[in-house]
């Protein structure tokens, strides 16, 4: 038994036929010693007398609000809730399995940008006697603060004969660092109470994995002379992280009729305009995705082909233009070839995802993961890789990126990747290895040597363990190269001569 909040206790029960249950001793919160009686809920039946009451809790009939009285006056309450465990698994009766992206997904979370603000939601078919409380932190062993609001009913839907209720909560990381590479996941814990049943649900994620931008805004059409083609332009959503030269998006533009089965024109672009073929009765739609990290696509923003107006009002800085001042020359160091670094780092992003695209959909986090990933160098908040830090002195950040590149290059050349199951030299991992080396050489000025970190002795003995470790390393590398690509894109846009 443990205390959920003041005067509310959770009794954990193994739930099977003829289970012995749990013996619980309740103590009346009073200095009085004599003449104390106990009742349960609204019943006037006296269950016992004395300052303590010992009960055997086996089923929901044994749970509820226990009250101690003296001479018709209430002294204190203790609310007992039950938390069922069947076959070693805690019950999940209150929330509905959303089955996306995988089975046993009860909580789903999304973030519109890298500010540390995110929203989680869950579904239930229960309409009454239901309360939720939400807690969150970054990391679990040495948790950093995340503040969550109250959960609210956000939508009601009819699903067949049932009504489905959606609850949501907004959370904000207390000291968010949008430009840093996350090393510890956000943990979200939801306590759910329905009548006398207690359940808890958890989710663990990196903000980068739950990013879903808002749709592009201000879609505009401009027909091209003597052509079937139309130029469509749009702007970054207002909620996306800035500057856009650092936090860049990529876009998918599609022309399609009302039915999904109809023919379509489709193209991908990093710009904020594209040329497409518009058909009568069709619509042009545009959606956005983080350019350097394969998180979710936004919903579509659409405008009909017939109208050459805009889909939504609103102005604002469009495109991925840098804005702001130029980065000044690096004191005591030479500037890198920003544009070359940008191209190579973007290639690294693509290779990191093609080296094992499945990695993006596998949950590789497990017990002891914080220890495994602690050995890997992360681009942290103080490393100067944010836009302001790059403006002040990009050398600190470039040194950090260089260290990381060398570290991963060594890892990819180590026994973890060269051992069984074997990879061919020109596999995506082979190409990734070569590109890491290429970018690190571009960054390393002649005759200037930066300190590099030793690679940890991680090599496992079993092939399956090696495979799992590869996936974890690649997953971590995907995050690292995304930050590096943002740095070089911003540098190319704002520093390159």
């Amino acid at each position: 038994i443990w205390e959920l909040k003041k005067d509310v206790y959770v009794v954990e029960l193994d739930w099977y036929p003829d289970a012995p249950g749990e013996m619980v001793v309740l103590t009346c919160d009073t200095p009085e010693e004599d003449g104390i009686t106990w009742t349960l809920d609204q019943s006037s039946e006296v269950l016992g007398s004395g300052k303590t009451l010992t009960i055997q809790v086996k089923e929901f009939g044994d749970a509820g609000q226990y009250t101690c009285h003296k001479g018709g006056e209430v002294l204190s309450h203790s609310l007992l809730l039950l938390h069922k465990k069947e076959d070693g698994i805690w019950s999940t009766d209150i929330l509905k399995d959303q089955k996306e992206p995988k089975n046993k997904t009860f909580l789903r979370c999304e973030a519109k940008n890298y500010s540390g603000r995110f929203t989680c939601w869950w579904l239930t078919t229960i309409s009454t006697d239901l309360t939720f409380s939400v807690k969150s932190s970054r990391g679990s062993s040495d948790p950093q603060g995340v503040t969550c609001g109250a959960a609210t009913l956000s939508a009601e839907r009819v699903r067949g004969d049932n009504k489905e209720y959606e609850y949501s909560v907004e959370c904000q990381e207390d000291s968010a660092c949008p430009a840093a590479e996350e090393s510890l996941p956000i943990e979200v814990m939801v306590d759910a109470v329905h009548k006398l049943k207690y359940e808890n649900y958890t989710s663990s994620f990196f903000i980068r994995d739950i990013i879903k931008p808002d749709p592009p805004k201000n879609l505009q059409l401009k027909p091209l002379k003597n052509s079937r083609q139309v130029e469509v332009s749009w702007e970054y959503p207002d909620t996306w992280s800035t500057p856009h030269s650092y936090f860049s998006l990529t876009f998918c533009v599609q022309v399609q009729g009302k039915s999904k089965r109809e023919k379509k024109d489709r193209a991908f672009t990093d710009k904020t305009s594209a040329t497409v073929i518009c058909r009568k009765n069709a619509s042009i739609s545009v959606r956005a995705q983080d350019r350097y990290y394969s998180s979710s696509w936004s919903e579509w923003a659409s405008v009909p082909c017939s109208g050459s107006g805009s889909s939504r009002g609103g102005s604002g800085s469009g495109g991925s233009g840098g804005g702001g001042s130029k980065l000044r020359a690096v004191p005591g160091g030479s500037s890198p070839a920003w544009t070359q670094c940008q191209q190579l780092s973007q290639k690294l992003c693509t290779l990191a995802w093609s080296a094992h695209p499945l990695v993006g959909h596998m949950d590789l986090r497990e017990e002891g993961d914080e220890e495994t990933t602690n050995d890997v160098p992360h681009i942290q908040c103080g490393d100067g890789c944010d836009p302001q830090g790059l403006r002040d002195n990009s050398q600190f950040c470039l040194q950090r990126i260089h260290q990381g590149l060398i570290f991963y290059e060594k890892l990819l050349g180590s026994d973890i990747f060269t051992g069984e199951p074997s990879l061919l030299p020109d596999s995506p991992v082979g190409q990734l290895h070569a590109s890491l080396l290429g970018l690190s050489q571009l960054l390393q000025p002649e005759g200037h040597h930066w300190e590099t970190q030793q690679i940890p002795s991680l090599s496992p003995s079993q092939p399956w363990q090696r495979l799992l470790l590869r996936f974890k390393i690649l997953r971590s590398l995907q995050a690292f190269v995304a930050v590096a690509a943002r740095v070089f894109a911003h540098g190319a846009a704002t520093l390159s001569p």
Partner: antibody, heavy 118, light 107 residues
Framework: QVQLVQSGAEVKKPGASVKVSCKAS????????LHWVRQAPGQGLEWMGW????????EYAPKFQGRVTMTTDTSTSTAYMELRSLRSDDTAVYYC???????????WGQGTMVTVSS | EIVMTQSPATLSVSPGERATLSCRAS??????LHWYQQKPGQAPRLLIY???QSISGIPARFSGSGSGTEFTLTISSLQSEDFAVYYC?????????FGGGTKVEIK
């Protein structure tokens, strides 16, 4: 399944015109874009243009503009490509292909060899 | 127009080996890149669309990667039926253009 059957080989004199046909089956004719791509002997592939059978809209590669005409007959589910003012370097296999997506080529016809020779 | 360059022009590979074919665009084309296989006397066949998307019915040994200006088609373990000419095609802008092709031949 979606199938495209093209007309037979043609031999033409320089300056003449050729009209190649492409009969579609296995799908609703107006649901797919139709493209024409050619391939000179021993050479690579060259895109000529597309037509939307639903409305007759066309887009031609600049190289063929003014010399090519693409048409369709929805009653017979047939597409046509006419190339005028033939030259010897127009000798090639001409392919029609269909796709629900405009910008790449999914289902191909078997090809029609057009030889331009005096 | 966008010029597509494929390399090498000819690739000699033994059956069972891996083949890596390259395609470069004269300007950035995002992931608007598609791969085709053509055997002698046959029409081309679509293998990969939008740089890395696989087609149902195409063996899993064919995979594509890349974005921007550099793209790769990888055949993980060449089978006898894979010896053919491979073309890349950009769909970033009209006119649609193809690379010159890479002939994969038996070593």
């Amino acid at each position: 399944q979606v199938q495209l059957v093209q007309s037979g080989a043609e031999v033409k004199k320089p300056g003449a015109s050729v009209k190649v046909s492409c009969k579609a089956s296995g799908y609703t004719f107006t649901d797919y874009y139709l493209h024409w791509v050619r391939q000179a002997p021993g050479q690579g592939l060259e895109w000529m243009g597309w037509i939307d059978p639903e409305n007759g809209d066309t887009e031609y590669a600049p190289k063929f503009q003014g010399r090519v005409t693409m048409t369709t007959d929805t009653s017979t589910s047939t597409a046509y490509m006419e190339l005028r003012s033939l030259r010897s370097d127009d000798t090639a296999v001409y392919y029609c292909n269909a796709n629900k997506e405009l910008r790449y080529f999914d289902v191909w016809g078997q090809g029609t060899m057009v030889t331009v020779s005096s | 127009e966008i010029v597509m360059t494929q390399s090498p022009a000819t690739l000699s590979v033994s059956p069972g080996e891996r083949a890596t074919l390259s395609c470069r665009a004269s300007q950035s084309i995002s992931i608007n890149l598609h791969w085709y296989q053509q055997k002698p006397g046959q029409a081309p066949r679509l293998l990969i669309y939008f740089a890395s998307q696989s087609i149902s019915g195409i063996p899993a040994r064919f995979s594509g990667s890349g974005s921007g200006t550099e793209f790769t088609l990888t055949i993980s373990s060449l089978q006898s039926e894979d010896f053919a000419v491979y073309y890349c095609q950009q769909s970033n802008s009209f006119p649609l253009t193809f690379g010159g092709g890479t002939k994969v031949e038996i070593k």
